[in-house]
């Protein structure tokens, strides 16, 4: 299980002859919202084929209104990411399509009025837990610019959130077999399926099915512990069939040899065996040399001056990487501050703040009560330079912009799924229902049984589509 | 107050490793990243490279690639620099330093690694 | 690589004089420069980051300035407690670089 994250940077006119008329006006003030439906795989379905992957809403963006004669700028963003929770493992390769929705906020009848300005669509190769992806897409005359990343939820890790983390049962490392889970160092990963009832704490497994213990635990589920009494040498049989408790860690425990070498004990250390085009103490020693060519986007190969260095790339400027194969992204540096979102615009770094902080890195805290607002009928408290807001009841957070989980009534209708979401909630509707709550019943022959004109919802509402 | 605690002086032959660390306290540990500057005996500073301390990806300037890696142990705030295979070269004062966005603003108070047969 | 340069490696002032250390970058660093302070026990400290922004603690005698490729730091009133030899450092490009340093000694 994990997360999708869309970041949208900017939408306004691409470059180019043929900008496109503002889509607000002075008599119709308007705001944008988008939408994200993505399909696993890379195929190239139909628009309104099911957003299977999951589909997601953002808030409506800040009003806006035409100066006149003013060509139309970047247009003003809603706030925060899109995210698309996905509940199984990440595909790695993925379509998707982002829709950029106007809302009208004239005196129409019915309330506002929303029409489709923009659709970009593509497919993309994505691992989970990488960084953030930069894209620019063009519709008609009109840019997007986005970033996206997909992440895992815990206790899922790995490029397609399908290993497990768990708590280490010992203290200093991880059972056998089994990795540390990084970045959570003090977490191990965890075998998918053992055997029922294996023993959480003391047994593990590398083939779903079986429960092999850790030191110091014996029996089919690993729940008995052994005795230290039958121990036939120092370093004798596994724990798991002689009941003898194992002293402590020996030389080749978590396998020091890297790039795929096994390992064996020496009386005084260990040995790894090395599998070809690699050697040094550990295997960490590629055999390739400048002649084969490693070095990726320009990197100037240099002959490494000892075996242990065959070659080292000198990478041009934007590259990283022993093969300069990584693009830097600077953004790695963690340059932004209180949070900020770090965009690394090739040219320049920039930090967008969080609300409440400024600067080129949100290095400054504007936090205080002047000029500041809680939302949602909150006030504002002051004290020691900061403020925080005093929220009513029903909504929480920073600002008081956050709802206490919407979805905690389950008002989705018809076995609807709920998504808790920035601007309340979002309901995506099971088969044969629509509607912002999925009240509403599609007919067989394609006609809804929608009333004219719903509160709060259109026939051409996007929210039908998730 | 913030501060970044490095681990004790080193005495190493040529081809062994070490492994330094450095103990932040006083701020949230995966909100900076770490970075690591190199001092030769009577030499300036040079910039070894950094380390995510959110996601754990390293970078490294282009002279220390191969026998250095840079890692994290994010429950206990500590990052680690690691030099393999030691050659009388890496004799050297090794400092890690906080990155705030413009600057290393606070630095560990270094460790002195010698190598000598 | 951006080279910087600090021309003076070394340097005698007074108590109480003005000093200027300056430094160059090979290219424009568009002020992303700083200064460090490293002290005879060999103990690092930032005091100017963003060419002329003070590093919290830093007394005011201290102050930075530039752009482009030229830069300097100057010590308004030289205090004993500042004998120590200063780095500059550009971090507008990677791999960040530093000059070689300014010795910085009583007369």
């Known amino acids: 299980a994990g997360v999708f994250e869309l970041q949208i940077h900017s939408f306004g006119p691409g470059p180019g002859p043929g900008a496109p008329r503002s889509p607000c006006s002075a008599r119709l003030p308007c705001r944008l919202f988008f939408r994200v439906c993505l399909k696993p795989g890379l195929s190239e379905e139909a628009a309104e084929s099911p957003c299977a992957l999951g589909a997601a809403l953002s808030a409506r963006g800040p009003v806006y209104t035409e100066q006149p004669g003013a060509p139309a700028p970047d247009l003003p963003l809603p706030d925060g990411l899109l995210q698309v929770p996905f509940r199984d493992a990440w595909p790695g390769t993925f379509s998707f399509i982002i829709e950029t929705w106007r809302e009208e906020l004239g005196d129409q009848i019915g309330g506002p009025a929303w029409s489709l300005l923009a659709r970009v669509a593509g497919r993309r190769r994505l691992a989970a837990g990488g960084p953030w992806a930069r894209d620019i897409q063009r519709a008609g005359a009109w840019e997007l610019r986005f970033s996206y990343r997909a992440r895992c939820e815990p206790p899922a890790v790995g490029t397609a959130c399908t290993r497990l983390c768990r708590p280490r049962s010992a203290p200093s490392r991880c059972g056998p077999g089994l990795r540390p889970c990084a970045p959570l160092e003090d977490e191990c990963e965890a075998p998918l399926v053992c055997r029922a009832g294996c023993s959480p704490e003391h047994g593990f497994c590398e083939q779903p099915g079986e429960c092999r213990c850790l030191e110091g635990w014996t029996g089919p589920l690993c729940t008995v512990p052994v005795s230290t009494s039958s121990c036939l040498s120092p370093r004798g049989p596994s724990s798991a069939t002689t009941g003898c408790l194992v002293p402590g860690p020996g030389p080749c425990d978590g396998n020091p040899c890297a790039n795929g070498g096994s390992c064996s004990e020496t009386p005084r250390s260990f040995e790894c065996t090395c599998p070809r085009g690699f050697y040094g103490l550990r295997c960490e020693v590629s055999g390739v040399t400048c002649a084969d060519g490693p070095c990726f986007n320009g990197g100037l190969c240099v002959g490494g001056a000892d075996p242990d260095s065959a070659y080292i790339c000198h990478c041009p400027p934007g590259f990283q990487g022993s093969n300069c194969e990584k693009r830097v992204d600077r953004c790695s540096l963690q340059p932004c501050r209180n949070g900020g979102l770090c965009l690394d615009l090739g040219h320049a770094l920039r930090c967008r703040c969080r609300a409440g902080f400024a600067g080129p890195r949100c290095e400054h805290d504007l936090d205080d009560c002047a000029g500041r607002a809680c939302a949602n009928g909150g006030t504002c408290v002051e004290g020691g330079g900061a403020h925080r807001c005093s929220c009513a009841l029903g909504f929480g957070g920073r600002d008081c912009r956050e709802r206490a989980d919407p979805c905690a009534a389950r008002p989705c209708a018809h076995g609807g799924r709920c998504y808790a979401h920035f601007s309340g909630l979002v309901c995506a509707c099971a088969p044969g229902y629509m509607g912002a709550r999925c009240e509403f019943p599609v007919h067989p022959d394609g006609a809804s049984a929608l009333p004219a004109a719903p509160p709060g919802l259109r026939p051409g509402d996007p929210q039908r589509y998730l | 107050q913030i501060q970044l605690v490095q681990s004790g002086p080193e005495l190493k032959k040529p081809g062994e490793t070490v492994k330094i660390s450095c103990k932040a306290s006083g701020y949230t540990f995966t909100d900076y990243s770490m970075h690591w500057v190199k001092q030769a005996p009577g030499k300036g500073l040079k910039w070894m490279g950094w380390?995510?301390?959110?996601?754990?990806?390293?970078g490294y300037a282009d002279d220390f690639k191969g026998r250095f890696a840079f890692s994290l142990e994010t429950s206990a705030s500590t990052a680690y620099l690691q030099i393999n295979n030691l050659k009388n070269e890496d004799t050297a004062t090794y400092f890690c330093?906080?990155?705030?966005?413009?600057?290393?603003?606070?630095w560990g108070q270094g460790t002195s690694v010698t190598v000598s047969s | 690589d951006i080279q910087m340069t600090q021309t003076t490696s070394s340097l005698s002032a007074s108590l109480g004089d003005r000093v200027t250390i300056s430094c160059r970058a090979s290219?424009?660093?568009?002020?992303?420069l700083n200064w460090y302070q490293q002290k005879p026990d060999g103990t690092v400290k930032l005091l100017i980051y963003?060419?002329?922004h003070l590093h919290s603690g830093v007394p005011s005698r201290f102050s930075g300035s530039g752009s482009g490729t030229d830069y300097s730091l100057t010590i308004s009133n030289l205090e004993l407690e500042d004998i120590a030899t200063y780095f500059c450092?550009?971090?507008?490009?990677?791999?960040?670089?530093f000059g070689g340093g300014t010795k910085l000694e009583i007369k």
């Open positions: 963003y060419t002329s």
């Open positions: 380390i995510n301390t959110e996601t754990g990806e390293p």
């Open positions: 330093a906080r990155y705030d966005g413009y600057a290393m603003d606070y």
């Open positions: 290219q424009d660093i568009s002020n992303y």
């Open positions: 450092q550009q971090g507008d490009m990677l791999p960040w670089t």
